[in-house]
Interface confidence: medium
């Protein structure tokens, strides 16, 4: 199960089957390498755990948008 992997993930072979609440998410990166079997998003949680997610799912897109907005508008 990829969401139990703590070493840096370079490719995703499986996606998490549950939505992760945005409060848990610290950052994300996209995996688009042709060496990987599928396009993916890797979320880093607030306890530095990496989780593979399907970029086609709406909650994944919404979470990426949320994180992008945070970076653009830091808290005073």
């Amino acid at each position: 199960q990829p969401d139990a992997i703590n070493a840096p993930v370079t490719c995703c072979y499986n996606f998490t089957n549950r939505k992760i609440s945005v409060q848990r998410l610290a950052s994300y990166r996209r995996i688009t390498s042709s060496k990987c079997p599928k396009e993916a998003v890797i979320f880093k949680t607030i306890v530095a755990k990496e989780i593979c997610a399907d970029p086609k799912q709406k909650w994944v897109q919404d979470s990426m948008d949320h994180l992008d907005k945070q970076i653009q508008t830091p808290k005073p």
Partner: antibody, heavy 122, light 112 residues
């Protein structure tokens, strides 16, 4: 105001078990990870592990596998740490803590309980 | 596990003077997401630890700007520009990049 209120000091016999509690107010524990940290007398801090109260997922530092069991009850907004087969090495202060937005540019916060002293007597 | 080594063990500083604490990790704390999960906490006498700094240099809410964190890779520093009486206690660096999360041994700041 966010607070983590921990249960009172425990004096327990060697070989017994003890269950500590950490009750949160001002936030919902199921929106955060809850961590436990050990501090032996006059020593540094050791991370025990975390629990995701929403689904019960846990991750333990290898040293505490089999020694510590973390659980949570979202209805009472409380996290628990059970320590088993106690020895003098387990005499310590145990802290619960939580943080959110750790690792984002948005900001961060971290809260700690006041600690629970566990004394193991032979 | 990642080893976190802090120096000095004890620091004796006059109020109003600067202070500096070093923290070295046994492996780079630069994560694959480009972030460095290095934090500093202060434990005042008889109190719980309190996080001061996360992500190397970001100050937690309410932490005075006399505290600054810096560094990269394996070498990190916490600086206090002018020590005040409330700053005494034990300072810990800790990392969240690698599992399991690990703490430094602590640096005790004493007031001269």
């Amino acid at each position: 105001e966010v607070q983590l209120q921990q249960s009172g000091a425990e004096l327990v016999r060697s070989g017994a078990s003890v269950k500590l509690s950490c009750t949160a107010s001002g936030f919902n524990i199921k929106d955060n990870y809850m961590h436990w940290v050990k501090q032996r007398p006059e020593q540094g801090l050791e991370w025990i592990g975390w629990i995701d109260p929403e689904n019960g997922d846990t991750e333990y530092a290898p040293k505490f596998q089999g020694k510590a069991t973390m659980t949570a009850d979202t209805s009472s907004n409380t996290a628990y740490l059970q320590l088993s087969s106690l020895t003098s090495e387990d005499t310590a202060v145990y802290y619960c803590n939580t943080w959110a937005y750790y690792g984002t540019s948005y900001g961060g916060f971290a809260y700690w309980g006041q600690g629970t002293t566990v004394t193991v007597s032979s | 596990d990642i080893q976190m080594t802090q120096t000095p063990l004890t620091l004796s500083v006059t109020i109003g003077q600067p202070a500096s604490i070093s923290c070295k990790s046994s492996q780079s704390l630069l994560d694959s997401d480009g972030k460095t999960y290095l934090n500093w906490s202060l434990q005042r006498p008889g109190q719980s630890p309190k996080r001061l700094i996360y992500l190397v240099s970001k100050l937690d809410s309410g932490v005075p700007d006399r505290f600054t964190g810096s560094g990269s890779g394996t070498d990190f520093t916490l600086k206090i520009s002018r020590v005040e009486a409330e700053d005494l206690g034990v300072y810990y660096c800790w990392q969240g990049t690698h599992f399991p999360q690990t703490f430094g041994g602590g640096t005790k700041l004493e007031i001269k």
